[in-house]
Interface confidence: low
């Protein structure tokens, strides 16, 4: 079937752009921050398979270390994450980008999406936590349309510096409780949820405490269902994965749609050495295709016993009568010994179309 020739625009999070090859960029992050390093292909051309290396050792992806072909994220950074990071071409080991990362105990500057300066401690010797921006905490009820990003903030201070934790409906709230994950920016006293869905409705409480006391604030989130709408997708984390030859990989994508969506897992492939058709549409092969039986589908693509040819970009695509939504996933496959081991991209077989 024809799904049109929709242009796919991949949104990018606020991140550090890569330096010119050969340059070393000096970066400082605060403890608890997310270190995000970006290494776009030189000259904007194709980059081929890459590997991220820290202090000479290939980085192993985990729930905290998210490795993609052009981007590296290290969540909840600590002092141990300081070091020399580089992005290299897997085949040639040529260094494409080089970063010197230092993680300090002090909060990082910037990365504050709404540009607010953080409140400074007023110099009180010791004391229980207190709100530094109470006027910014008036809005207790937040009603947002589905698919929007929500940010709750509880700017506070105290001595010693208090800790902040979050509850949803009175229970501990962690990233794994939500398919799209959450961003906890401790230095900004904030909780961020991207692409909210109806199941995110509820009461969110920040708990700020130190040894002298505890304060809390509760916000109520209402997610407005826009009907009808094109499917809403959330990518399960990590969206980009590196796997060892012969292992199993699972990509996870959540689809919300009022109307029964047609869901597909696709893989980008090359045809006669080209990744795009004559009209500029990428070539993809259909791996799985079905009509969802529910309005909230938890969809998975499982790849068993992966080989080099399984590496590349995968798409979770959902289509209903309103429109199309898709999420991209990257898989990098390497040999059993070292993450930097040379990989040769193999041509794909199977039914291919430009989609």
């Amino acid at each position: 079937e024809s799904l049109g020739t929709e242009q796919r625009v991949v949104g990018r999070a606020a991140e550090v752009p890569g330096p010119e090859p050969g340059q070393q960029e000096q970066l400082v992050f605060g403890s608890g921050d997310a270190v995000e390093l970006s290494c776009p292909p030189p000259g904007g051309g194709p980059m081929g398979p890459t590997v991220w290396v820290k202090d000479g050792t290939g980085l192993v992806p985990s729930e905290r270390v998210l490795v993609g072909p052009q981007r590296l994220q290290v969540l909840n950074a600590s002092h141990e994450d300081s070091g020399a990071y580089s992005c290299r071409q897997r085949l040639t080991q040529r260094v494409l980008c080089h970063f010197s990362v230092r993680v300090t105990d002090a909060p990082s500057s910037g990365d504050d999406e709404d540009g607010e300066d953080e409140a400074e401690d007023t110099g009180v010797d010791t004391g229980a936590p207190y709100w530094t921006r109470p006027e910014r905490m008036d809005k207790k009820l937040l009603a947002v349309p589905a698919a929007n990003t929500v940010r709750f903030r509880c700017p506070a201070a105290g001595n010693p510096t208090p800790s902040i934790s979050w509850l949803k409906n009175g229970r501990e709230f962690r990233g794994e409780h939500r398919i799209g994950g959450i961003k906890l920016r401790h230095q900004q006293w904030s909780l961020v949820m991207e692409s909210v869905v109806p199941s995110d409705r509820g009461n969110y409480t920040c708990v700020v405490e130190n040894k002298f006391g505890s304060i809390r604030q509760t916000y109520t989130l209402d997610v407005l269902e826009r009907s009808p709408h094109r499917p809403i997708l959330q990518a399960g984390l990590p969206a980009n994965q590196t796997a060892v030859l012969g292992s199993d990989v699972e990509f996870h994508c959540k689809v919300y749609s009022d109307a029964q969506p047609h869901i597909q897992w696709l893989k980008h492939v090359e045809v006669n050495g080209s990744k795009v058709g004559p009209d500029g549409t990428p070539y993809v092969t259909v791996l799985k295709s079905w009509i969802s039986e529910s309005v909230e589908a938890d969809v998975r693509l499982r790849l068993a016993n992966v080989s080099e040819r399984d590496g590349g970009e995968y798409l979770c695509r959902a289509t209903n009568f309103i429109g199309v939504a898709e999420k991209a996933f990257w898989l990098s496959v390497h040999g059993p010994r070292a993450a930097e081991e040379e990989l040769v991209e193999a041509d794909e077989a199977g039914s291919v179309y430009a989609g």
């Epitope: 409780h177 799985k288 295709s289 079905w290 039986e293 969809v299």
Partner: antibody
Amino acid sequence: EIQLQQSGPELVKPGASVKVSCKASGYAFTSYNMYWVKQSHGKSLEWIGYIDPYNGGTRYNQKFKGKATLTVDKSSSTAYMHLNSLTSEDSAVYYCAREGGNYEAWFAYWGQGTLVTVSA
Amino acid sequence: QIVLTQSPALMSASPGEKVTMTCSASSSVSYMYWYQQKPRSSPKPWIYLTSNLASGVPARFSGSGSGTSYSLTISSMEAEDAATYYCQQWSSNPLTFGAGTKLELK
């Protein structure tokens, strides 16, 4: 109508092997993973593993690695489970089950079960 | 592996009575799934993604929970609800089931 039709009961001797079949109908066989589940008499359910009929890829519960082998015949839309070196511990009802229509991690359709009895 | 502990193992309820059974996970899970099984029958899908009723399941059933604590509730017990109910997770390998809660009619 989606149906999973399993083969009949088996009485086998210790040390022997058995092959249980599960014929699928009413849906695109290669579009959904097929799972196998063991239920010992009066006991709970245990996941054995699954096979993706699309590419033959398998994943096993570590406990059943070496005990069970999963295969498919795409031409007949049939999934098979081969159990080897049988002991009395393997006496159970074995179910094939298909995952939910949207790849949820659950079993939306079940076969009627195949009773395997291991006895000398 | 994640162990799912169902309680009570055995319970009985009179028609019209509210019934709640629980499933406790040894580690946090994203979703819980529930199945109903009657003697000499295959399990039937009952509740998926914690709170969604499978096709044909009466509205008197509901599911809830998060993290390590989940429950299945029947608002008003009926004779046909007598069965064994199993919970299941696949947030972590291997996929595991609970030992079951057998619900009898009083």
